[in-house]
Amino acid sequence: ATKLTEEKYELKEGQTLDVKCDYTLEKFASSQKAWQIIRDGEMPKTLACTERPSKNSHPVQVGRIILEDYHDHGLLRVRMVNLQVEDSGLYQCVIYQPPKEPHMLFDRIRLVVTKGFSGTPGSNENSTQNVYKIPPTTTKALCPLYTSPRTVTQAPPKSTADVSTPDSEINLTNVTDIIRVPVFN
């Protein structure tokens, strides 16, 4: 079996997590993708998903999460803006492939958000705020609610550096709201 590994990100409140998840483009380009959080002993919880079928370079925003699927490159870009301490936790990208179980993409992301903005010049606090303030045009998201029970047992023990609490929730707007935002880098 493929060993589950984590890539760790330590960020300050107000900053942006900006990561990618690679996938096999020949197989999954148009498949619906999702961003999930894994709580100890719980089923992975879907926080945001792309449309079905997934559209190329078409940003979808759910609260503070922005997903952008680059079909040409076989990768999903995930941004979590204006990070809060409560966002700390273990995250993963998955590909929905009904009727089969979701396909998990490696590696998982261990996010640790700490209090107090770093205040360094050129930090990403300002660059994320204008993203968050883009006026929304809202539609309904259709994120499948099922997840593989097998992925629960695969969740590694929580890192000692993980400052989230088991019952802390990601502070999002209604997860059914999808906001379209223009493409930007």
Partner: antibody, heavy 119, light 108 residues
């Protein structure tokens, strides 16, 4: 232990060809994008080419486009760089490197193989 | 392609000094920036990824900051083994990658 081992370097005449190989071990090779990066004697690092985990996407620096071809054999855990129409300015140490999954940074590098293009 | 300008090109410092190296991108690259250390005759070694995340096994005296176009690598207290050349590297989401010109940290 995660390891990358390059081979295939050597002396070649201008206009000639060479094929570099990079044997990977200690990780699930097929799930990671891979790159070739070179360094001319006394110079800085120059990215040459990259390939997605499945091999479906390939990328090249303008300086080698049309002359170099990157490929991979996931069944052999091996990355390749086919170099044609070699020029003196291609003389360098060539490194293969593994990308992290979540970023475009290169977290594991081989020891490098020297390519000398000279008549 | 996005260009990276590193400064200074070289710096002379003593053990225990705080050393700061900057890297400026020609356009916004969010946090898609990495820092590497290279010693003569050796392969580069990843120090910092995603602008500020410390690679596993790298001493905590190394830190990275910045986002957008301006980035900094800081060595809080220079150690004898830190004398080397440092490179920044970017790739917004996917290649092409580009490297900065390098900064050589020399013994004063």
């Amino acid at each position: 232990e995660v390891q990358l081992l390059e081979s295939g370097g050597g002396l070649v005449q201008p206009g000639g060809s060479l094929r570099l190989s990079c044997a990977a071990s200690g990780f699930t090779f097929s799930t990671y994008a891979m790159s070739w990066v070179r360094q001319a004697p006394g110079k800085g690092l120059e990215w040459v080419s990259a390939i997605s985990g499945s091999g479906g996407s390939t990328y090249y620096a303008d300086s080698v486009k049309g002359r170099f071809t990157i490929s991979r054999d996931n069944s052999k855990n091996t990355l390749y760089l086919q170099m044609n129409s070699l020029r003196a300015e291609d003389t360098a140490v060539y490194y293969c490197a593994k990308s992290k999954h979540s970023t475009t940074s290169l977290d594991v590098w081989g020891q490098g193989t020297m390519v000398t293009v000279s008549s | 392609d996005i260009q990276l300008t590193q400064s200074p090109s070289s710096v002379s410092a003593s053990v225990g000094d705080r050393v700061t190296i900057t890297c400026r991108a020609s356009q916004d690259i969010s946090s898609w920036l990495a820092w590497y250390q290279q010693k003569p005759g050796k392969a580069p070694k990843l120090l910092i990824y995603a602008a500020s995340s410390l690679q596993s096994g790298v001493p905590s005296r190394f830190s990275g900051s910045g986002s957008g176009t301006d980035f900094t690598l800081t060595i809080s207290s220079l150690q004898p083994e830190d004398f080397a050349t440092y490179y920044c590297q970017q790739a917004v989401i996917h290649p092409p990658y580009t490297f900065g010109g390098g900064t050589k940290v020399e013994i004063k």
